[in-house]
Interface confidence: medium
């Protein structure tokens, strides 16, 4: 089932998938100058079986008659999203994801392809969420977001990210007290019931709590 | 079959350092949270200190905070606790565990959302 809306956007910040489910598509888009060859695929599919998830079709760019490029753009291994993709301004740590069963890597680029691709994610895709340079993030929680059913619809769910200039405020307005750990999946699917009062964030802003139980570091 | 296997402890003098090291095989290591816990003698397991699968977050106890740093290596599906300071009290069997879900940034500190353990190593302080 694929996801009606794109991930939630989040000022000052961007999202990548670090690997993607299958049915997940990849429009096959090109740079300007260029289209998709003659009967060439309109997307990649991730498809797979028990063991093996990989990318179906190929996309394939060739050059175009000048005066007909009405061109759409599309992501670039480091910039994607569903539909609308941005660029991680420091790439996250890379992750094994050919070894995470259902889901394919990242597709390597093709000839003249777009500088941003779209992805249409399915239910059960996760995004993660960094701010962009320049930008400090404050955590209540996940920085990710999961595209998910409910009621036979799709949404995603909230990140809880914040992300904010060097010279802003350090706490989350409203919040008397920074949480530590995030709790629980997001929107409140609690898996590891701890209260906020059992954590204190320890980051190079938070300022020095009372004693509790656990201490979180966010590097 | 998935494996976590602990090694580095021994008996140690109050104030010393000491490193353990777990290794592990059979998974996606490198998706999933890791956890160290322990457990004293005739005492409750205790969580100590976990890392997030991309290294952007640790989570420690207070009792060992400042004393003991969490790091792991993705490359060699390593997980690493260094732990420095020792006192009589941190005197324990010390386990290592793979968090249950993969790619998340929820960090955990209850050792039901950790489903694979391993069979832990002693750690003996003594004064």
């Known amino acids: 089932e694929l996801c009606d809306d794109d991930p939630p956007e989040i000022p000052h910040a961007t999202f990548k998938a670090m690997a993607y489910k299958e049915g997940t598509m990849l429009n096959c888009e090109c740079k300007r100058g260029f289209r998709r060859i003659k009967s060439g695929s309109l997307y990649m599919l991730c498809t797979g079986n028990s063991s093996h998830s990989s990318w179906d079709n190929q996309c394939q760019c060739t050059s175009s008659a000048t005066r007909n490029t009405t061109k759409q753009v599309t992501p670039q291994p480091e910039e994607q999203k569903e539909r609308k993709t941005t660029e991680m301004q420091s790439p996250m740590q890379p992750v094994d994801q050919a070894s995470l069963p259902g889901h394919c890597r990242e597709p390597p680029p093709w000839e003249n392809e777009a500088t941003e691709r779209i992805y249409h994610f399915v239910v059960g895709q996760m995004v993660y969420y960094q701010c962009v340079q320049g930008y400090r993030a404050l955590h209540r929680g996940p920085a990710e977001s999961v595209c998910k059913m409910t009621h036979g619809k799709t949404r995603w769910t909230q990140p809880q990210l914040i992300c904010t200039g060097e010279m802003e405020t350090s706490q989350f307005p409203g919040e008397e007290k920074p949480q530590a750990s995030p709790e629980g999946r997001p929107e409140s699917e609690t898996s590891c019931l701890v209260t906020t009062t059992d954590f204190q964030i320890q980051t190079e802003m938070a300022a020095t709590m009372e004693t509790s139980i656990f201490t979180t570091e966010y590097q | 079959e998935v494996q976590l296997v602990e090694s580095g402890g021994r008996l140690v003098q109050s104030g010393g350092s000491l490193r353990l090291s777990c290794a592990a095989s059979?998974?996606?290591?490198?998706?999933?949270?890791m956890g160290w816990f322990r457990r004293a003698p005739g005492k409750e397991r205790e969580f100590v200190a976990a890392i997030s699968w991309n290294v952007d977050n640790k989570l420690y106890a207070n009792s060992v905070k400042g004393r003991f740093a969490i790091s792991r290596d993705n490359g060699r599906n390593m997980v690493y606790l260094q732990m420095n300071s020792l006192k009589p009290e941190d005197t324990a069997v010390y386990y290592c565990?793979?968090?249950?879900?993969?790619?998340?940034?929820?960090?955990?500190?209850?050792?039901?959302?950790?489903?694979?353990w391993g069979q832990g190593t002693q750690v003996t302080v003594s004064s």
């Open positions: 059979g998974r996606a290591f490198s998706t999933h949270n």
């Open positions: 565990a793979a968090d249950n879900i993969p790619l998340s940034s929820d960090m955990r500190a209850t050792a039901t959302e950790y489903d694979v």
